[in-house]
């Protein structure tokens, strides 16, 4: 049996229904069997877990997703073995295997793989700060969302009106969410907002930076 699945990965928003398309061509016999299974990201195919079987004219959903899985066509004997997964969770992200068996059609292995990503908006990020906050010093502002798929990009902005910082004194990394401020001055003080964004939405946090005069060293 030759199984056909989309070549491009599938993305479905959190809470929506994912349709994992799987089709095939074979003269369906009484021994026809379909199995859908799931592998977590980064795990080998050998560690797949069954989530649905169809055999002897009957459908058997199984495992932790059993209440949420069904077939677009039941019975799946018309060439369409497409799986529907409702109310998708972040833990549904991974690889799905569609395997069709129909002895004596052994021309190919009857296996198709579909990668599913559940799209999750960024959670409210956590803003933190470390380093020297005295004039002339350097500090790092960090921003990180614990949730979000695809991984959010981070953008720092300073709120309010202020003099333009000198070039190179404010460098941010959109991937790590880090903003490095160098050569701090009193005018560097203020509120900084980090916005975490992906295709599902955005979330933000704010942090107030207070730059102080360096403490005067005394000679005894």
């Amino acid at each position: 049996v030759e199984v056909k699945v989309p070549t491009e990965p599938l993305s479905t928003p959190l809470g929506k229904t994912a349709e994992l398309t799987c089709t095939y061509s074979t003269s369906v016999g009484d021994s026809f069997a379909l199995e859908w299974s799931f592998v977590q990201p980064g795990k080998p195919i050998s560690e797949s877990h069954p989530i649905l079987y169809f055999t002897n004219g009957h459908l058997y959903p199984t495992g932790s997703k059993s209440k949420r899985v069904s077939l677009l066509q039941n019975p799946p004997t018309v060439g369409v073995a497409t799986l529907k997964l409702t109310d998708v969770h972040p833990s549904d992200t991974g690889t799905y295997l569609c395997q069709v068996n129909n002895p004596p059609d052994f021309y190919t292995n009857g296996l198709g793989l579909i990668n599913l990503t559940v799209l999750v908006p960024p959670s409210n990020p956590l803003c933190s700060q470390s380093g020297q906050t005295s004039v002339g010093g350097s500090t790092a502002l960090r921003c990180s969302s614990s949730e979000g798929a695809p991984k959010p990009v981070y953008n720092w902005v300073r709120l309010g009106t202020f003099p333009t910082p000198s070039p190179g004194s404010m460098v941010q990394d959109e991937v790590s969410g880090q903003l490095i401020l160098t050569n701090l001055s009193l005018t560097s003080s203020g509120t900084y907002r980090c916005v975490a964004t992906n295709q599902m939405g955005s979330a933000s946090c704010e942090l107030t930076l207070s730059v102080t005069e360096p403490s005067q060293g005394r000679v005894a």
């Epitope: 061509s25 003269s27 026809f32 019975p75 369409v80 004596p104």
Partner: antibody, heavy 118, light 107 residues
Framework: EVQLVESGGGLVKPGGSLRLSCAAS????????MSWVRQAPGKGLEWVAS????????HYPDSVKGRFTISRDNAKSSLYLQMNSLRAEDTAVYYC???????????WGQGTLVTVSS | DIQMTQSPSTLSASVGDRVTITCRAS??????LAWYQQKPGKAPKLLIY???TLPEGVPSRFSGSGSGTEFTLTISSLQPDDFATYYC?????????FGQGTKVEIK
């Protein structure tokens, strides 16, 4: 040599019923998916029903669904098509055909003519 | 349902001619296409399946090509026995449908 021989065609009034038969020989009937394909006079081919090797799965196009029933008796190497609520547009030569491992039709019978007319 | 469209509907040719018939599917059917030959008053005969595979006994002057939505049946050198009507059929998802046919007649 593979042989498929249809019988049971004839003249029937609209709304009437007819049962077609197909006697198979020359191959292992119980291992083969089978279909009925029809051809209206002067027209093209239309698949009308299929059945799996042991009879567990049957399929029909919308044009005949609910009116036609395909069945088989593997002990007798026979295929059947029960046709109810017949319409004028069901007038055609009905062929019995064996399916390959993929659903193309590798052997055909000579056909039997069904005429639906008042 | 997948629609199959053949062209031309009729083709006039002479013995020895190279003849090409086209079949288009309304959606991707990969290589799941069969071709049949039918002579008047006779049952169709399988010529090609999986777009390009010839069953045993089919003369090598017949060949098939294509994948996706566009397919061709070619007769490299038309013989007297080849004047007939030719049909394509997809063997992908149910319902399996046929093209309307191409009649190859003597010029």
């Amino acid at each position: 040599e593979v042989q498929l021989v249809e019988s049971g065609g004839g003249l029937v009034k609209p709304g009437g019923s007819l049962r077609l038969s197909c006697a198979a020989s020359g191959f292992t009937f119980s291992n083969s998916g089978m279909s009925w394909v029809r051809q209206a006079p002067g027209k093209g081919l239309e698949w009308v029903a299929s059945i799996s090797d042991g009879g567990l799965y049957t399929h029909y196009p919308d044009s005949v669904k609910g009116r036609f029933t395909i069945s088989r008796d593997n002990a007798k190497s026979s295929l059947y098509l029960q046709m109810n609520s017949l319409r004028a547009e069901d007038t055609a030569v009905y062929y019995c055909a064996r399916q390959g491992v993929r659903p193309f039709f590798d052997y055909w019978g000579q056909g039997t003519l069904v005429t639906v007319s008042s | 349902d997948i629609q199959m469209t053949q062209s031309p509907s009729t083709l006039s040719a002479s013995v020895g001619d190279r003849v090409t018939i086209t079949c288009r599917a309304s959606e991707n059917i990969y290589s799941y296409l069969a071709w049949y030959q039918q002579k008047p008053g006779k049952a169709p005969k399988l010529l090609i399946y999986n777009a390009e595979t010839l069953p045993e006994g089919v003369p090598s002057r017949f060949s098939g090509s294509g994948s996706g939505t566009e397919f061709t049946l070619t007769i490299s050198s038309l013989q007297p026995d080849d004047f007939a009507t030719y049909y394509c059929q997809h063997h992908y998802v149910i319902p399996w449908t046929f093209g309307q046919g191409t009649k190859v007649e003597i010029k």
